[in-house]
Interface confidence: low
């Protein structure tokens, strides 16, 4: 089961996989959780009774029984991986560590005003895993205010030592705070000729990219498909890096594909979750168990439920096509990937879904959308909520989007007349307003957070967060939408939809069924021409047709402008304002969410 508490002065005996250095027991737990095999760990804290060379060591452990004997040891802190836990897991660590030096390859040293400036530099430097900053009090004058950016092969320090007047910390790339670009293209018939830092077996280029994305040092990759001429290299995924951060040479070779790590937008792409099935494919690895099950989906479930299982192969028996059972081979390896991939043997293979919780829930696929029509169907926009006010009577006030299990993103102008969060109700998983009865469950609002610079919708900063009184459980009907990535600022979204229960025309009424409209994005320059009397800033985004027609309207405010990119829906805009509704030459104006990522992340992490 899930055990989150740490055990003080306790050491787990045996089961060692590897030893790394971490600045705290909590960070050791994070490293263990993200390691393919680690289930338990022991961390050696700074302690007078311990040899200082052992301080800050984090020993990652595995056990067939999922537990190990406990021994009393002063200064040792032990605990369990979060792999066994149902909750979301993030690799983000915003802490800084005073009087600690984290050792690694120093590749850049420059003057910074303070620790935060140094951390920001690390976050926006492609190679940086962590940093050490020497403050202005540092004894050696030439090192004062120096920010050292560092990397190691595994992303963790090679050693950690005590040193006064320095501060260390980690890159915040995994907190979605990096400005580095995300290159999402996969290039066919391309080999990148650079240093291989590792190689693994993968069934396709997408799995290869995901493996590259969660490997701390991989910046780009080359994948040899199953049709690659050299048999021994088929299904080989080469993880690569270079000094510049970009491939130095591209070679044209058929049956090879190459691409880039998505590390700086990993909060909005699946990195750990490989949910596809690979037909006529066998994954080889260390066998954990063989079970008789009905079908490959049941086999995947068995693997997901078995804590140590990383991947599986289902072998249908000749009778299984008539409803019989087949053999389910549960497997594991040292790195979480198959040791070999074979084709043409009739097996169906795949990966555990247990690691899916390490990805943002917003990246999981939703039901296919109904094309055409203006009325939505159940589960089509599961992040859309209807915000009701109860004063003077209960009515739909605004739309909003689920971005976290306790967070709704909406427009600030929705609260111009709202005195208190007590009168607000959030209804999720709703298609028709008539579904809402007295007995319909809702989420109360604990807190309204309006952007400090908001004055009125038309001048911008029309953004607000609602913190719910209780956390919501995600289902097919209610789940979050991904925030866009800073690294995706230059992406041209082509599949965008505005949704809401708002009026269908200016002098209209709230609609019963959630409406949807496909709208093209309009450039800021184009939009500025249409709104001469207003200042259209880069913090706004416009969408709509020149000829008018499809648009957001009264009652849609605060709702999402959702754009699908690479199979993942992103919250690109928040319905804010416009001249009339669906008027010719008057696009709708939306709050440009990517420009508020820092604000959203700080507010949701701070409260």
């Amino acid at each position: 089961g899930c055990i989150t508490e740490l055990l003080a002065d306790t050491c787990f005996q045996g089961g060692d996989i590897t030893t790394v250095f971490t600045p705290s027991a909590k960070h050791c737990q994070l490293v263990c959780t993200h390691h393919p095999r680690c289930l338990l760990f022991t961390f050696m804290a700074e302690s007078p009774s311990q040899d200082p060379t052992k301080w800050f060591t984090c020993i990652l452990k595995d056990s067939v029984t999922e537990t190990l004997p406990r021994v009393n040891m002063t200064g040792a802190i032990s605990g369990y991986s979060f792999k066994q836990c149902p909750h979301q897991i993030s690799a983000c660590n915003r802490n800084v560590y005073v009087d600690l030096v984290m050792k690694g390859m120093n590749y850049n040293g420059s003057i910074a005003r303070n620790v935060q400036e140094c951390q920001e530099r690390c976050t926006n430097s492609v190679h940086c895993h962590f940093f050490t900053y020497a403050t202005s009090q540092f004894p050696s004058a030439e090192h004062r205010n120096v920010c050292l950016l560092k990397y190691t092969e595994m992303g963790t320090p090679t050693r950690i030592t005590k040193l006064s007047m320095v501060v260390s910390g980690f890159s915040l790339k995994s907190c979605a705070l990096s400005n580095l670009a995300c290159i999402r293209d996969i290039f066919p018939s391309t080999v990148f000729a650079d240093n291989n830092i590792d190689s693994v077996m993968a069934p396709d280029a997408f799995v290869c990219r995901r493996i590259c994305t969660h490997h701390p040092s991989c910046l780009f990759f080359t994948f040899f498909s199953q049709e690659w001429p050299k048999e021994s290299e088929r299904n080989l995924c080469l993880l690569k890096t270079s000094e510049s951060g970009l491939p130095s040479t591209r070679i044209k070779k058929h049956k090879a594909l190459s691409g880039f790590s998505l590390q700086s937008c990993r909060h909005s792409v699946p990195v750990f979750c490989h949910s596809s099935f690979y037909h006529n494919t066998d994954f080889l690895g260390e066998e954990l168990d063989i079970v008789d099950v009905k079908g490959h989906e049941a086999c995947q479930k068995m693997c997901t439920d078995a804590i140590r299982c990383q991947f599986f192969t289902y072998s249908p028996s000749p009778e299984s096509c008539h409803g019989g059972k087949g053999k389910c081979y549960l497997k594991l390896s040292s790195n979480g990937s198959p040791t070999k991939i074979l084709h043409g043997r009739g097996g169906i293979s795949g990966y555990t879904l247990r690691l899916c919780k390490m990805d943002n829930v917003c990246t999981t696929k939703i039901k296919p959308r109904i094309v055409g029509g203006t009325a939505s169907v159940h589960g089509e926009w599961p992040w859309q909520i209807t915000l009701h006010t109860t004063s003077p009577i209960r009515r739909h006030l605004c739309g909003g989007s689920i971005i976290g299990n306790q967070w709704i993103l909406t427009a600030a102008h929705c609260f111009d007349q709202v005195e208190s969060p007590k009168i607000l109700r959030v209804y999720s998983g709703i298609l028709n307003q008539t579904e809402i009865k007295k007995s319909t469950s809702f989420f109360g609002v604990q807190k309204i957070i309006i952007h400090d610079q908001y004055e009125e919708a038309e001048s911008g900063y029309d953004i607000a967060l609602l913190k719910l009184e209780t956390a919501m459980n995600y289902t097919d009907a209610q789940r979050p939408i991904c925030l866009p990535s800073k690294g995706d600022r230059n992406v041209i979204y082509t599949d965008c939809w505005v949704t809401g229960w708002g009026y269908r025309r200016l002098a209209g009424e709230i609609q019963n069924t959630l409406q949807k409209a496909n709208v093209p994005l309009v450039t800021t320059e184009e939009c500025q021409i249409r709104y001469k009397g207003h200042k259209i800033t880069n913090k706004m985004i416009c969408a709509g047709y020149r000829e008018g027609g499809k648009d957001a309207c009264k009652g849609d405010s605060g709702g999402p402008l959702s754009c699908k990119h690479n199979e993942v829906w992103h919250l690109v805009g928040i319905t804010s304002w416009g001249e009339g509704c669906g008027q010719r030459e008057r696009p709708g104006v939306y709050t440009n969410v990517v420009e508020y990522l820092d604000w959203i992340l700080k507010k949701t992490q701070a409260v």
Epitope: R94, N95, V96, V98, R113, N114, V115, Q116, Q119, T135, S136, Q137, F138, P139, A141, R144, N145, V167, D452, D598, W599, K602
Partner: antibody
Framework: QVQLEESGPGLVAPSQSLSITCTVS????????IYWVRQPPGKGLEWLGM???????DYNSALKSRLSISKDNSKSQVFLKMNSLQTDDTARYYC??????????WGQGTTLTVSS | DIVMTQSHKFMSTSVGDRVSITCKAS??????VAWYQQKPGQSPKLLIY???YRNTGVPDRFTGSGSGTDFTFTISSVQAEDLAVYYC?????????FGGGTKLERL
């Protein structure tokens, strides 16, 4: 041990200039930033500006045009100069040493009254 | 410039109580917040820096937490000598700035 001591004129007429000296001991000015902070009677603390170990300066935006901070490392002294004084500049003026961006050692402060 | 707001100018407490003082930054200041104690006629004294690190010699009843824009300073069990004015300060971006102060007084 670490000490900071402010010395100033005590009384200044409106529109005149002010010069306060902060003399430090127990540490070197090349290794530490020094801040100036003031506190009007019965009110809160206001950050005026600072001089970094390497001589760079930063100022409170509202007072930038009237403030100047300099130092003499060899004499272990930091100087705050402020011109065009008004009655609302009446306050206790402190210097303090930088510690991870905060202020770990403070002087006792010197009281300035701006009055005709 | 970053504005630091301490919403309570005064807080009443009794010896042995747990008390929390909040401070809000107008923009993200990461974890760069310090807390000071000032008693009448004395210079301010640094208690906490970088949100949660206690200065040398500061009793462990004083703790700090938060990140981004919302910060909290807590005294787990108030002692008579803790009655004073407490200030928060951001040291993220110059010009650095203080909160308006919270006076902790006897109930």
């Amino acid at each position: 041990q670490v000490q900071l001591e402010e010395s100033g004129p005590g009384l200044v007429a409106p529109s005149q200039s002010l010069s306060i000296t902060c003399t430090v001991s127990g540490f070197s000015l090349t290794g530490y930033g020094i801040y100036w902070v003031r506190q009007p009677p019965g009110k809160g603390l206001e950050w005026l500006g600072m001089i970094w170990g390497d001589g760079r300066t930063d100022y409170n935006s509202a007072l930038k045009s009237r403030l100047s901070i300099s130092k003499d490392n060899s004499k272990s002294q930091v100087f705050l100069k402020m011109n065009s004084l008004q009655t609302d500049d009446t306050a206790r003026y402190y210097c303090a040493r930088d510690y991870y961006g905060s202020k770990d050692y403070w002087g006792q402060g010197t009281t300035l009254t701006v009055s005709s | 410039d970053i504005v630091m707001t301490q919403s309570h100018k005064f807080m009443s407490t009794s010896v042995g109580d747990r008390v929390s003082i909040t401070c809000k930054a107008s923009q993200d200041v990461s974890t760069a917040v310090a807390w000071y104690q000032q008693k009448p006629g004395q210079s301010p004294k640094l208690l906490i820096y970088l949100t949660s690190y206690r200065n040398t010699g500061v009793p462990d009843r004083f703790t700090g937490s938060g990140s981004g824009t919302d910060f909290t300073f807590t005294i787990s069990s108030v002692q008579a000598e803790d009655l004073a004015v407490y200030y928060c300060q951001q040291h993220y971006k110059t010009p650095y700035s203080f909160g308006g102060g919270t006076k902790l007084e006897r109930l």
